[in-house]
Interface confidence: low
């Protein structure tokens, strides 16, 4: 169950989808990927206060225990809830191939 | 693909399963759970350096971009890869009920 989407830290500060532009060089892919030359990497960034976007019961527990024992138990973390597929044109020994990666671009985010 | 399991930070410092003992009061469950009175909560705690236990391609990208832009892109985070079910005996209006929760106790951890 996705819990509250209201961010008590102010607009845009809590866990949400962001886009980071990265070149093949940034990603360390220049030697095996031909295209795209640049990737708009969607990723999950932001704080996970209280029950904000709690992914499941485990996330709720983590929030409670982090409040009690902040030095021992970390706060929940903002991670992908689902992904978008992306096609890469890869270099191969014989030429090029198209490969779809299902776990490359974050689609939606939650706290866990 | 699960990447390297060698922790460069020293034994036990990287992402792994930990057990945290918690009472019903700690968890805020005292008003709706009868048993168990105490839960051994298994959770994922620890650092995610380089490609340590990278869950997928997204985690690998995150590592690369964190290295380049540490102020913008956070390091991957240690989260459950799977869960163990747990049965709680809950209070109900008519007495008690047994309820299995599939997403309460972490079983295995990875970095994402």
């Amino acid at each position: 169950a996705r819990n509250g989407d209201h961010c008590p830290l102010g607009p845009g500060r809590c866990c949400r989808l962001h886009t980071v532009r990265a070149s093949l060089e940034d990603l360390g892919w220049a030697d095996w990927v031909l295209s795209p030359r640049e990737v708009q990497v969607t990723m999950c960034i932001g704080a996970c206060p209280s029950q904000f976007r709690a992914a499941n019961m485990h996330a709720q527990i983590k929030t409670s225990l982090h409040r009690l024992k902040p030095d021992t138990v970390p706060a929940p973390c903002c991670v992908p809830a689902s992904y978008n597929p992306m096609v890469l044109i890869q270099k191969t020994d014989t030429g090029v191939s198209l490969q779809t990666y299902d776990d490359l671009l974050a689609k939606d985010c939650h706290c866990i | 693909a699960r990447n390297g399991d060698h922790c460069p930070l020293g034994p036990g410092r990287c992402c792994r399963l930990h057990t945290v003992r918690a009472s019903l009061e700690d968890l805020g469950w005292a008003d709706w759970v009868l048993s168990p009175r105490e839960v051994q909560v298994t959770m994922c705690i620890g650092a995610c350096p380089s490609q340590f236990r990278a869950a997928n391609m997204h985690a690998q990208i995150k590592t690369s971009l964190h290295r380049l832009k540490p102020d913008t892109v956070p390091a991957p985070c240690c989260v459950p890869a799977s869960y163990n079910p747990m049965v709680l005996i809950q209070k109900t209006d008519t007495g008690v009920s047994l309820q299995t929760y599939d997403d309460l106790l972490a079983k295995d951890c990875h970095c994402i």
Partner: antibody, heavy 119, light 107 residues
Framework: EVQLVQSGAEVKKPGASVKVSCKAS????????LNWVRQATGQGLEWIGD????????IYNQKFKGRATLTVNKSISTAYMELSSLRSEDTAVYYC????????????WGQGTLVTVSS | DIQMTQSPSSLSASVGDRVTITCKAS??????LAWYQQKPGKAPKLLIS???SLETGIPSRFSGSGSGTDYTFTISSLQPEDIATYYC?????????FGGGTKVEIK
Amino acid sequence: EVQLVQSGAEVKKPGASVKVSCKASGYTLTDYNLNWVRQATGQGLEWIGDLNPYNQGIIYNQKFKGRATLTVNKSISTAYMELSSLRSEDTAVYYCAREGRGGAWFDSWGQGTLVTVSS
Amino acid sequence: DIQMTQSPSSLSASVGDRVTITCKASEDIYHRLAWYQQKPGKAPKLLISGATSLETGIPSRFSGSGSGTDYTFTISSLQPEDIATYYCQQYWSPPFTFGGGTKVEIK
């Protein structure tokens, strides 16, 4: 050539639902997200939500969450947007739009479907 | 939600004039900005993505610039066929939001 062809104009009564279709051709449907945007007469553009046809992942604009439902039938390369509990202020042209690769700019648009809500 | 404030809401210029439209985001959108042209009765058409990248087939008189929260769209030499309404749109964070539009007319 990428084409998004939408269903025809609809007239609905307040409280009813409408389902608009968007048939994609000229590319592989599952390779790109499909977004829905509306525009009331003489007004600006308002994003409703997007659908990942590959895994049916959806992000809704909170304003429409609970009233809008985005679905896809991959076998016929068609996406749908259903809006329920219609009110007069939902009168608008509804567009489907293909999302760019890796970023939510919209590089191809349907021709639009006029939905009129009137008693 | 990120608010996009576009100005002016309308403008009138002569053929050959340089036309500038601005778009201000309520927070940093890190170049995640697109510009569209919409003619009456038609769907919007993508002109620019990534704040500055001109789409294939779009005339070079159209350009975009800016960073952070402030972005600019320019038509270097206005042509009769450029009469339309122009919209900016942020895609940094959902819900993706559009500016209110700028209607461009010929004097």
